[in-house]
Amino acid sequence: TPEVWVQVRMEATELSSFTIRCGFLGSGSISLVTVSWGGPNGAGGTTLAVLHPERGIRQWAPARQARWETQSSISLILEGSGASSPCANTTFCCKFASFPEGSWEACGSLPPSSDPGLSAPPTPAPILRAD
């Protein structure tokens, strides 16, 4: 069964800067990745970035740099200030659309005990939805 993992890290140098890393553990070909915050995309969450393997990367503030890390993982840097700044308990979600598996989404947030600059290891997060 395919899985999605999500890792959230707060940067030590800037407390309003977060790095989100997501990966897809499956054999299919990824056709789209959507990163959102505040909940799953389409279920109250707000889209931060859309990464298409052929068409490019569309991102919304406070997303600063979204990129492909590998064929099946992405990273996103957020730099917020004021109302658009993420906070320590913000939930981030990643949805991977792949062929032939369909869509798989998981969410994660900063581990409660994390110090800035630290993060939990990238373990698979609970699968919230498989379309």
């Epitope: 298409h52 393997p53 052929e54 068409r55 490019g56 990367i57 569309r58 991102q59 919304w60 997303a63 740099q65 979204a66 990129r67 492909w68 590998t70 064929q71």
Partner: antibody, heavy 120, light 113 residues
């Protein structure tokens, strides 16, 4: 063929607002994001933002977030950009442009541009 | 934001000559997923709007003469006009079309001697 029609010029007073139009024809209007680009005299092209005509979803360049507001009217296949609190720095040619079908940000069809002059 | 730098800012060539102009990006435009470079070139003739010539660094837009050749990878790109014509008098802009916000170079003005 694809056409994006824009008015030629507008003269506006400092502090005022202006709403620019871009009427699309020759393709399925809801299927392509519409982009707006600024070109000040002798300066670089600057991307202002984009709007998805199918659902009104917008995306702005941060430096224009408080200056420009993008909307569409699907029934007339027209995109609009409202510019507020105009100053002489906003005097420029403003283009609407359609994104290329195979990539988000290459722009394959452009309007002729609307020249905005801000002067009292 | 990705910064695009073009050189030279202007050049004057005679009809029939080969023209090359450069564009550099502050970060790589190579997408590791599909090995495509997200770099476009536009031509803007005097008093006209920009026209897309090349995208994905080397793919010519439909209807663009084959004397326009885009090349390069990563951060260094070149537009070559193999045999310049009088109608090529224009400003040429490069643009990264990889991620938001798309950004443009300052342009190269081509004058015909």
């Amino acid at each position: 063929q694809v056409q994006l029609q824009q008015p030629g010029a507008e003269l506006v007073k400092p502090g005022a607002s202006v709403k620019l139009s871009c009427k699309a024809s020759g393709y399925s209007f809801p299927s392509y994001w519409m982009h707006w680009v600024r070109q000040r005299p002798g300066q670089d092209l600057e991307w202002i933002g984009e709007i998805n005509p199918s659902n009104g979803l917008t995306n702005y360049n941060e430096q224009f977030r408080n200056k420009a507001t993008l909307t569409v009217d699907k029934s007339s296949s027209t995109a609009y950009m409202q510019l507020s609190s105009l100053t002489s720095e906003d005097s420029a040619v403003y283009y609407c442009a359609r994104h290329h079908g195979s990539t988000y940000y290459a722009l394959d069809s452009w309007g002729q541009g609307t020249s905005i002059t801000v002067s009292s | 934001d990705i910064v695009m730098t073009q050189s030279p800012s202007s050049l004057a060539m005679s009809v029939g000559q080969k023209v090359t102009m450069s564009c550099k990006s502050s970060q790589s435009l190579l997408n590791s997923i599909n090995q495509k470079n997200f770099l476009a070139w536009y031509q803007q003739r005097p008093g006209q709007s920009p026209k897309l010539l090349v995208y994905f660094a080397s793919t010519r837009e439909s209807g663009v003469p084959d004397r326009f050749i885009g090349s390069g990878s990563g951060t260094d790109f070149t537009l070559t006009i193999s045999s310049v014509q009088a109608e090529d008098l224009a400003d040429y802009f490069c643009q990264q079309h990889y991620s938001t916000p798309p950004t443009f170079g300052g342009g190269t003005k081509l004058e015909i001697k």
